[in-house]
């Protein structure tokens, strides 16, 4: 099985024990590590951070001791802007320039492939996204002709049904991608006005339309029905939780909220907590399991957080094995307890290790 793990370059800027550099990663933990994110400047793939080249080197030296490790560079991301991607993909010349720029950049910096993180194509972009993938793959095939190992091509896709329908021609893009990472998280947000888990495995008992689509099982099944081969589908598992501020004494699933949860000490983003921050939160918190959805949540005071733990990730891995998927994807290594100092197990990357162990178990 593949274990595809994202590392985010901006995690270097977190304070103190939250700061993560690629040399802190475990070279034997994942089969693939994806560095997020690269930029596109003047239609050419480019660095984003001032020290990206140094960090690329740090990451790719992990392969010295584990030659089976594959590294990919992810281009795009939330801050890149969907329209910027759209304009490159929709213009024949811009698209060609971008595609041509990718192989030399990846080779120069020691990457084994490219991950497309167009978040997200709109209605106008569905065909262009397919064309971009098809032409990128053709370029990778052509570039490998002189006996080089062919560069890998993957894409991170939304797990939301509406976005899948409007943005992706799943059957066509699946033909050209080596694997597809489906982002089976962020199903529930503060805008709903109630608590709810952001990455449930199954549909909740109370879920009505459109909530019935907002779970991992539905998203994976839908992708398969649309023509994604199970052998290319990699299922996303988050090492972060989504938090809410409760608006009343109710604390269960569906309880009213006043907004997102308070920011974490290190990640500093309202409504989001890294797993290592959740381990801190759990001291003195009350933990519940949403039985049907097979995921936990915890409450403390007026704070509510839905997250994944070692038990829930094992359930998710068993599920992906039952569906004969290609493996698991983790967002992100730097949100796991990468130092092993927060979660009291003397184990670095406890969640990702639990996924790895479950994938290896017979």
């Amino acid at each position: 099985y593949k274990l595809v793990c994202y590392y985010t370059s901006w995690s270097q800027y977190r304070e103190g024990d939250g700061s993560c550099f690629p040399d802190a990663l475990d070279r034997f933990l994942c089969t693939h590590i994806i560095y997020s994110f690269a930029n596109i400047s003047n239609d050419h793939i480019d660095t984003w951070e001032w020290n990206d080249v140094t960090l690329y080197g740090m990451l790719n030296t992990l392969k010295n001791r584990n030659p089976n490790l594959k590294t990919l560079l992810s281009v795009g991301g939330w801050n890149f802007g969907s329209q910027r991607f759209s304009k490159i993909a929709s213009n024949t010349q811009s698209r060609r320039t971008f595609i041509k720029s990718v192989p030399p950049f990846l080779r120069t910096h020691g990457f084994d492939g490219l991950d497309l993180a167009w978040l997200y194509p709109g209605r106008r972009d569905k065909q262009h996204f397919t064309t971009l993938i098809k032409e990128m793959k053709a370029e990778f095939i052509k570039e490998a002709q002189p006996g080089k190992k062919q560069l890998l091509l993957s894409a991170a896709l939304s797990a939301g049904k509406v976005t899948i329908d409007s943005s992706y021609d799943i059957a066509k893009i699946s033909q050209h991608l080596d694997f597809i990472s489906i982002m089976t998280y962020d199903f529930h947000g503060a805008w709903r006005g109630t608590t709810g888990h952001h990455s449930p495995l199954f549909r909740g008992q109370e879920d009505a339309s459109p909530d019935r689509f907002s779970n991992t099982d539905y998203a994976v099944g839908y992708m398969l029905r649309l023509g994604a081969p199970a052998s290319k589908l990699v299922m996303g598992i988050p090492t972060f939780g989504r938090s809410f501020t409760l608006a009343s004494s109710e604390t269960g699933v569906g309880a009213p909220i006043s907004g997102p949860g308070i920011p974490g000490r290190f990640t500093k983003e309202a409504g989001t907590l890294a797993y290592y921050e959740i381990c801190d939160f759990l001291r003195g918190a009350t933990v519940h399991r949403i039985l049907g959805q097979q995921v936990p949540y915890a409450t403390k005071g007026n704070q509510w957080v839905g997250y994944d733990d070692q038990e829930s990730v094992k359930s998710k891995v068993q599920y992906l094995k039952d569906r004969q998927l290609a493996g698991a994807m983790v967002w992100a290594l730097d949100l796991d307890d990468f130092q092993g100092s927060f979660c009291g197990q003397d184990l670095r990357f406890p969640l990702t290790n639990a996924i790895k162990d479950a994938l290896a178990a017979t």
Epitope: Q83, R84, K87
Partner: antibody, heavy 123, light 111 residues
């Protein structure tokens, strides 16, 4: 054919509230993001607010943030703009407009507009 | 937030060509699509150009759009001017959850 019909405009005193409605027909309302755009007398167009197809995301112009609330009822094919703490500078024709996209991240454009409803804020 | 600056007014004779410019104050004009809307008195606005240079169905091919990265601006060109083209024209673009309009250009068709 696509039709957008605004209503709820009128004369209102500063500091008071007003709710505009936009009745949509001729298309699947729940498959499109929707906007409010206004034009003050003798001035240009100004974008006011947007809401995604399912109401999950909403954005506002700085000039109305904290005072105006955009919402939608997909079962009634209707878009709303709740305007509180109205000011003289909010006097304008308010247009409801359909976005070409469902979500807000891809920044669609306004492909259909209503005829507008006039809001006058005056004491 | 960025701004889009248009000339206040332009005028030209029937049959001639007119170009209306739209300059972006910050951020690249090439990073986001530009639209152009026509607004006639008493009518709802209509789109004459979308996605920089695309004409929606029903818009005559006398209307064309382009962008120029070197001047960080977009242009609407109307050739073979007709009296019915007299209207206000607005450019519009998007960035980071803001939909921004230019100040508008009044096109007067002389004669």
């Amino acid at each position: 054919q696509v039709q957008l019909v605004e209503s709820g405009g009128g004369v209102v005193q500063p500091g008071r509230s007003l709710r505009l409605s936009c009745a949509a027909s001729g298309f699947t309302f729940s498959s499109y993001a929707m906007h409010w755009v206004r034009q003050a007398p003798g001035k240009g167009l100004e974008w006011v607010a947007v809401i995604s197809y399912d109401g999950s995301n909403k954005y506002y112009a700085d000039s109305v943030k904290g005072r105006f609330t955009i919402s939608r009822d997909n079962s009634k094919n209707t878009l709303y703009l709740q305007m509180n703490s109205l000011r003289a500078e909010d006097t304008a024709v308010y247009y409801c407009a359909r976005d070409t996209e469902l979500q807000l991240w891809s920044g669609g454009y306004f492909d259909y507009w209503g005829q507008g409803t006039l809001v006058t804020v005056s004491s | 937030n960025f701004m889009l600056t248009q000339p206040h007014s332009v005028s030209e004779s029937p049959g001639k060509t007119v170009i209306i410019s739209c300059t972006r104050s910050s951020g690249s004009i090439a990073h986001n699509y530009v639209q152009w809307y026509q607004l006639r008195p008493g009518s709802a606005p209509t789109t004459v150009i979308s996605d920089d240079d695309q004409r929606p169905s029903g818009v005559p091919d006398r209307f064309s759009g382009s962008i120029d990265s070197s001047s960080n601006s977009a242009s609407l060109t109307i050739s073979g001017l007709r009296t019915e083209d007299e209207a206000d024209y607005y450019c519009q673009s998007f960035d980071d959850s803001n939909w921004v309009f230019g100040g508008g250009t009044r096109l007067t068709v002389l004669g």
